[in-house]
Amino acid sequence: EDGGPACYGGFDLYFILDKSGSVLHHWNEIYYFVEQLAHRFISPQLRMSFIVFSTRGTTLMKLTEDREQIRQGLEELQKVLPGGDTYMHEGFERASEQIYYENSQGYRTASVIIALTDGELHEDLFFYSEREANRSRDLGAIVYCVGVKDFNETQLARIADSKDHVFPVNDGFQALQGIIHSILKKSCIEILAAEPSTICAGESFQVVVRGNGFRHARNVDRVLCSFKINDSVTLNEKPFAVEDTYLLCPAPILKEVGMKAALQVSMNDGLSFISSSVIITTTHCSDGS
């Protein structure tokens, strides 16, 4: 939109935002942070949800890929009046709930959670937050935490997937804008191209999947290349190599000319998938060509 970095990944993105009393005078900064970030996830296959928490968790905008609904959701987000306690677990509950519903539909889209809080969680609330974040992970989500001002980094490292999934903002709310680039880079998992994009019918091939964020998985051994053939059968293949910007994968043998395989990637052994508009097609190759 403004020439800044963008993410082309197709996944479900959940913002879980602290709207407790302590952020009352900083809601504008939180809103602008989310707005700037939301506009940089530009895949038509990306869905987004806005969840706020204080003494209760509320889904302000339920999961949608509709850009008009997202625009309206951002308007609602701007109107939020903070107040109440920091029941972060309530926010995670609302995300897990949606992930569960989407999973029950049959097709499992990858989920990324970006949770923002400004305070240290009291011991019991930390326990609940960690438990609910674990439940989100059980459902296939990758969890990032943004900590502003008086946060406890050790706590957030336990709620997030790891300490590498925590974005500390030590200089207060006005410094939130400064982490947009790094959070986008870290949270974005995208498939940009496949080489070759055309393969010979009936022959075995290796495919280089170009993109970003493939090493953001909690365990790179759980990364899979997935090929959805002619919109029906899905074949998962273990990559030979996993690097941040590419995967080297065995391609399935597609017997007939004109068959299409849509490329997807799973970061969690097939529990959920990042979609893309990258297609591999088959062609007839004569002998010696």
Epitope: T58, N134, R135, D138
Partner: antibody, heavy 117, light 106 residues
Framework: QVQLKESGPALVKPTQTLTLTCTFS??????????VSWIRQPPGKALEWLAH???????SYSTSLKTRLTISKDTSKNQVVLTMTNMDPVDTATYYC?????????WGQGTLVTVSS | DIELTQPPSVSVAPGQTARISCSGD??????VHWYQQKPGQAPVLVIY???KRPSGIPERFSGSNSGNTATLTISGTQAEDEADYYC?????????FGGGTKLTVL
């Protein structure tokens, strides 16, 4: 296909402990995300949720009955067990087990438990 | 926990549209599910996540949720739709049911 079946005593005396077993098939409790709930319904009254056990062994209980309930699972036997202590005639109800996490998509047919001396 | 309030009864003529409400504080910010229960039978899920229909549930069943009210709509109501209907939500690790609505098909 998914099936659940409740079993346990039809008659319980006041102050006794009720033990109910839910035996299920067609899904696994070792799969991420889901779980099994217990719900009851006194004759002619509304549904009341009692307890839930998740695939990762987390448990949740109804706030009003928390002190009297215990839920557990035996993944290898495909069973979930609910115990309810200090039974009272007001606990007379049909007790159901159901599969789900945040909503309940498959239910057992229920078992009627009468509390009477 | 959130409280879900339903009207005790709703009547509808066959072929007409029945609407059953479920109200609660800012219920539009959480998800609501609906169950149908016929006498002597276990409940059956008819709508989940506000508006999604499980397989096998007729298209005449639909759901919506915004503001302080969720609504189950049965268009072209049939005699076999006469039953008790319960709304349900999830709040603070608990499942919460409404008090139920008896739908009478006149």
């Amino acid at each position: 296909q998914v099936q659940l079946k409740e079993s346990g005593p039809a008659l319980v005396k006041p102050t006794q402990t009720l033990t109910l077993t839910c035996t299920f098939s067609g899904f696994s409790l070792s799969t991420s995300g889901g779980g099994v709930s217990w719900i009851r319904q006194p004759p002619g009254k509304a549904l009341e949720w009692l307890a839930h056990i998740y695939s990762n062994d987390d448990k949740s209980y109804s706030t009003s009955l928390k002190t009297r309930l215990t839920i557990s699972k035996d993944t290898s036997k495909n069973q979930v067990v609910l115990t309810m202590t200090n039974m009272d005639p007001v606990d007379t109800a049909t007790y159901y087990c159901a599969r789900g996490g945040y909503f309940l998509d498959y239910w057992g047919q229920g078992t009627l438990v009468t509390v009477s001396s | 926990d959130i409280e879900l309030t339903q009207p005790p009864s709703v009547s509808v003529a066959p072929g007409q549209t029945a609407r059953i409400s479920c109200s609660g504080d800012n219920i539009g910010g959480i998800y609501v599910h609906w169950y149908q229960q016929k006498p002597g039978q276990a409940p059956v899920l008819v709508i989940y996540a506000d508006s999604k229909r499980p397989s096998g549930i007729p298209e005449r069943f639909s759901g919506s949720n915004s503001g302080n009210t969720a609504t189950l709509t049965i268009s072209g109501t049939q005699a076999e739709d006469e039953a008790d209907y319960y709304c349900q939500s999830y709040d603070i690790t608990s499942l919460v049911f409404g008090g139920g609505t008896k739908l009478t098909v006149l």
